[in-house]
């Protein structure tokens, strides 16, 4: 007989999720309406395509990237989709309430859907650090808290530092990474004896994880340019991101081979490092003036990513209980920081060139933004971790970590848990 959810969770999950969905429907009914303007058809199609790219990245890219566990691939993909669907709904409302609510109505445009998808993507990056150790009811909590925290962070940064949509959304890498790591730190860590094999990767799931990485690689230019309004800025962002991710792929595969004593290539290194360039140039992708600079940044990011993948998992596993194949947390925390530092360095060089004496002020503002993003990520992550530890969620027992059978019906299996 196949295993089932514990009784209490069977009662809790559908009730919790459906009540929440009903509440969201009511909020949409009372507070939202569609943008009534006559869109230029060509512009509408272009705008929709960017949103579609983001959805592909989230559902297929991040969904499959996290599916490399031997016995947790189904849950990784499906739970990602569940979180994306829920996160987008809540993010649309939240962004509307924070930016438009004085008018009493939230106007939904293709741009607001794009913004919401990117907010939901933050959760999918963070969740990599905890997937396999939590159930769907807990993931619902994580979605709500993280989307709310990110939305408020963006609003605060926008108001205090006067940054535009692109600049304040590009903190997503650092925010998502530190949020996920701090949630993971709060969850029960040790894997009991005899269950270590579950967090190991298998060939078929690793192939699907590589498929996820490929989708992310293909659409990363769309992600980095999605919130830029001007077509010229968007074009430059696309070009620079493309050059950076192209070089980071070459660096990842070469560096992975270099890092292995027998010159073999690690799947895990490649999964993460192929995306390195895209994360590293995210903040400054539209400001980079020439391809060679984007390529150099891609190279540096690829090397840092491979180095991080080689030396950090041991530390993450010991301290945070994150399995070796969950590479996004430490990868994005390193590369997100690199991206922010690159932006600050470019600002400094530019300000020195202009000779306008504003270096200190500009750097202070940028460091202030970054620090705020990290602090809010850590605080909200710890709060989420504490919430997820509450008994009401009936978290899976440590012995049932990383196991699809805890959550899924497999009729062909004779033996359940």
């Amino acid at each position: 007989m196949s295993s089932k959810y514990p009784r209490s969770v069977r009662r809790c999950l559908p009730l919790w999720a459906l009540t929440l969905e009903a509440a969201l429907i009511l909020l949409f009914y009372f507070f939202t309406h569609y943008d009534a303007s006559l869109e230029d058809q060509k512009g509408l199609v272009a705008s929709y395509q960017v949103g579609q790219d983001l959805t592909v990245m989230a559902a297929i890219g991040l969904g499959f990237l996290t599916s490399s566990f031997r016995r947790h691939s189904w849950s990784s993909v499906a739970f990602n989709l569940f979180m994306l669907a829920l996160g987008v709904q809540w993010a649309i409302l939240l962004d509307g309430f924070l930016s438009q609510f004085p008018s009493g109505k939230v106007v939904i445009t293709l741009f607001s859907i794009r913004l919401a998808t990117m907010s939901a993507l933050s959760v999918l990056i963070s969740v990599d650090a905890v997937l396999g150790k939590v159930n769907l009811a807990q993931l619902v909590v994580m979605v709500l808290v993280e989307v709310t925290a990110l939305g408020n962070l963006r609003m605060v940064i926008s108001n205090i530092f006067n940054t535009d949509y692109h600049m304040n959304m590009m903190h997503i890498y650092v925010f998502a990474a530190y949020f996920g790591l701090s949630v993971a730190w709060c969850l029960p860590k040790p894997l009991p004896e005899g269950t270590e094999d579950k967090d190991q990767t298998a060939t078929i799931p690793s192939l699907s994880a590589m498929l996820g990485a490929l989708f992310l690689w293909m659409f990363w230019p769309s992600f980095n340019s999605a919130l830029l309004r001007s077509p010229i800025e968007r074009k430059n962002a696309v070009f620079n991101t493309y050059y950076a991710v192209a070089v980071s792929v070459v660096t990842a595969i070469s560096g992975s081979s270099l890092a292995h004593p027998q010159g073999k290539i690690s799947k895990t290194y490649v999964h993460s490092a192929v995306l390195a360039g895209g994360v590293a140039v995210g903040t400054s992708c539209h400001l980079i003036p020439s391809p060679w600079l984007a390529m150099v940044l891609g190279l540096v990011a690829g090397l840092i990513s491979v180095g991080g993948a080689k030396y950090l998992p041991g530390c993450c596993n010991r301290v945070l209980g994150i399995p070796h194949s969950s590479i996004m947390g430490y990868n994005f925390s390193l590369l997100g920081l690199l991206g922010e530092i690159i932006y600050i360095v470019l600002l400094v060089l530019d300000t020195v060139g202009a000779g306008n004496g504003m270096i200190g002020f500009q750097v202070l503002l940028s460091i202030g933004e970054l620090s705020l993003a990290i602090v809010i990520a850590l605080m909200s992550g710890l709060l989420t971790g504490l919430l997820l530890n509450l008994k009401i969620w009936k978290a899976p027992h440590e012995a049932k970590y990383f196991d699809d059978q805890v959550f899924w019906k497999f009729p062909h299996l004779a033996v359940g848990f």
Epitope: S47, S230, I232, R234, N236, P289, D350, G353, A354
Partner: antibody
Amino acid sequence: QVTLKESGPVLVKPTETLTLTCTVSGFSLSNARMGVSWIRQPPGKALEWLAHIFSNDEKSYSTSLKSRLTISKDTSKSQVVLTMTNMDPVDTATYYCARMRLTMVRGVITYYYYSMDVWGQGTTVTVSS
Amino acid sequence: DIQMTQSPSSLSASVGDRVTITCRASQSISTYLNWYQQKPGKAPKLLIYAASTLQSGVPSRFSGSGSGTHFTLTISSLQREDFATYYCQQTYRTPTWTFGQGTKVEIK
């Protein structure tokens, strides 16, 4: 020769919706380096930027008036339309449309300089019952 | 939003005078600043963009300088046709563009 011409009602009643049209010639609304902005100027007061539309149909609005404004364009007719809901006597002003030109300069970073290089002659709108 | 403050709000000068108008931004806007001239009953006209680049067709007596938060528009030798109102505008945050409150240059 680049020209922009605003058209719309001269008189609007309070709470009504104002619809203004800007017809452009001499450049295309699909040109990636061009966009169209709406600006207004109440009698004896300063200029106030209202809304902007880029060639790729991306839009942006003044923070304070965001909830009341809608900008759209019809590239085939070379027209940009601004609608402003719930008009009030304080909205009495001369409304201008202007071409927003992008000049790109590459240095240590890439600069995107926007400037309103060609303006329409303006249309005066009075809000009164 | 970024606030732009111009000073003085008005000034009186004679033909041939050197006139300087100042514009301050509430935060650093690098060199993303434009200057416009507006005569009564007319639409504004672009004079300078990118803080210091003269728009084609604008006389060379007009010049702009500054970066960060402090900018100036200078008319080296005021002509009769220069009596007008001058506005600064920031374009740093694409695209939430704000104008200063204006400086009126009158005949003394």
